[in-house]
């Protein structure tokens, strides 16, 4: 299946966290295909981070792309980690918080946390940059969102949505002020380039989110972070896309690109490091 | 200069553990900027990756689902060297093995392989 | 697990011409830190496989600048600029985003 992008308009009310994906195929958008058939299908809508219904011509298309509403859940859902309702108080921490830490059989030195079960609290480490397990976040909070109990003994989502121990309801954590402008895209375009540990001399690209452009910059060839692209292309694919204009009532519009279909990288990556 | 020299049987009878050996010279099995593989190939499969094992503030390993109840692979620090075993083995286990380093510093990649052992699965 | 599919299996070859050959990945290749997880390997007849480009497009140590690598997300290519008789045996390319580590089956290269 070919890889494509298709720009749409996207309103929505409320504002979520980075999405976090179990398959980056999760991320394309819906692909009905240049044929003309009316097959009943459904996708995984990064946006309302739901499965969905589309219709599929028949030919083509693309990965995100699946016969039952079951099957679009169980490729990118993430249940085990994101089960926003839960039917109990004592929440369950996703198997994956048990996982040793584990550093990957590359070695980048890479700052990254894991949940240890022996100390019951998440922990730094050095993450190699490839392979490894679930159990690695980018961040410290989100670690602690997905795999430490709360204080009152629950789990906390990283939905930043806490379970209401007293009527079982779902308290929102936090509320933003909506701004005219906010960067809704990849994380790591906010950070600043970093050459890295290693003697190398490689030309790279970074995301200047001061400027708005994508600008060069030398890579030692280890280590480093995520901003950082190995064309003008790849980083203005990754990072440009994701300013959003906000409308009335803190809604998002998201805005509209048109242009002809074309193969594209997709620029939402998983944060999670894929499971063994 | 990193050598791989395998050694082991290359006939195993059915049902039967396949055993080999992989001794390094030119680079340590405890080394924090390596790896250690066993990949097989065969007509039917081409190159199939079977586990890898590695040293960093311990040991860690990895084995492919395929053979993960079957396999383990381990270390001989004393000896500098690593084996595979594969149990409960079948015709479709023939094929010729491999032992491979992965470099883990800058060439991330299988850049030394053992010179490749035929094992025949057969009564 | 990802599949990753080399086309053309067979490719002959004129000494001084050009080749080319095909990789794609069941899915994208996760691009982080600026590296794409893809290795490309030559299976010289009678040898063991042996490492040409990292990451890539990075050229393994020893290896002619006539072999180069490129391509993100689903689709890479490993290029030979001047095919010579010595670059004749199986290419492999071989993924390392997730595991298991997987490989293509091979594109067999040979003189005309």
């Known amino acids: 299946d070919s890889e494509e992008d298709e720009e749409h308009t996207i309103i929505t009310d409320t504002e979520l966290p980075p999405l976090k994906l179990m398959h980056s195929f999760c991320a394309f958008k819906a692909d009905d295909g240049p044929c003309k058939a009316i097959m009943k299908r459904f996708f995984f809508n990064i946006f309302t981070r739901q499965c969905e219904e589309f219709i599929y011509g028949g030919c083509e298309g693309n990965q995100n792309r699946f016969e039952s509403l079951e099957e679009c859940k169980k490729m990118c859902t993430r249940d085990n980690a994101n089960r926003i309702i839960k039917t109990t108080l004592q929440q369950e921490k996703p198997d994956f918080c048990f996982l040793e830490e584990d550093p990957g059989i590359c070695r980048g030195y890479i700052t990254r946390y894991f949940y240890n079960n022996q100390t019951k609290q998440c922990e730094r480490f050095k993450y190699g940059g490839c392979l490894g397990n679930m159990n690695n976040f980018e961040t410290l909070e989100e670690c602690k969102n997905i795999c430490e109990d709360g204080p009152n003994g629950f789990q906390v989502d990283n939905y930043g949505t806490q379970l209401n121990a007293v009527n079982n309801s779902l308290t929102p954590q936090s509320t933003k002020v909506p701004s005219l402008f906010e960067f809704h895209g990849p994380s790591w375009c906010l950070t600043p380039a970093d050459r890295g540990l290693c003697r190398a001399n490689e030309n790279r690209f970074y995301y200047n989110s001061v400027i708005g452009k994508c600008r060069p910059f030398k890579y030692s060839g280890c280590g480093g972070n995520e901003n950082n692209f190995t064309s003008k292309q790849e980083c203005l694919r990754a990072c440009k896309k994701g300013f959003i204009q906000r409308i009335s009532k803190g809604g998002l519009i998201k805005t509209k690109r048109k242009r002809k279909k074309q193969r594209v990288k997709i620029a939402y990556e998983e944060i999670f490091v894929k499971n063994m | 200069q990193v050598q791989l020299q395998q050694s082991g049987p290359g006939l195993v009878k059915p049902s039967q553990t396949l055993s080999l050996t992989c001794a390094i010279s030119?680079?340590?099995?405890?080394?924090?900027?390596?790896?250690w593989s066993w990949i097989r190939q065969s007509p039917g499969r081409g190159l199939e990756w079977l586990g890898i094992i590695y040293k960093r503030s311990k040991w860690y390993n990895s084995y492919a689902v395929s053979v993960k109840s079957r396999i383990t692979i381990n270390p001989d620090t004393s000896k500098n060297q690593f084996s595979l075993q594969l149990n409960s083995v079948t015709p479709e286990d023939t094929a010729v093995y491999y032992c491979a380093r992965w470099h883990s510093d800058k060439m991330w990649g299988f850049d030394d392989w053992g010179q490749g052992t035929l094992v025949t699965v057969s009564s | 697990d990802i599949v990753m599919t080399q086309s053309p299996l067979s490719l002959p070859v004129t000494p001084g011409e050009p080749a080319s050959i095909s990789c794609r990945s069941s899915?994208?290749?996760?691009?982080?830190?600026?590296?794409?997880?893809l290795n490309w390997y030559l299976q010289k007849p009678g040898q063991s496989p042996q490492l040409l480009i990292y990451?890539?497009?990075n050229r393994a140590s020893g290896v002619p600048d006539r072999f180069s690598g490129s391509g993100s997300g689903t689709d890479f290519t490993l290029k030979i600029s001047r095919v010579e008789a010595e670059d004749v045996g199986v290419y492999y390319c071989?993924?390392?985003?997730?595991?298991?580590?997987?490989f293509g089956q091979g594109t067999k290269v040979e003189i005309k």
């Open positions: 071989q993924q390392y985003d997730s595991y298991p580590l997987t």
């Open positions: 990451k890539g497009s």
């Open positions: 030119g680079d340590s099995v405890s080394s924090n900027s390596a790896a």
């Open positions: 899915q994208s290749l996760v691009f982080r830190f600026g590296i794409t997880y």
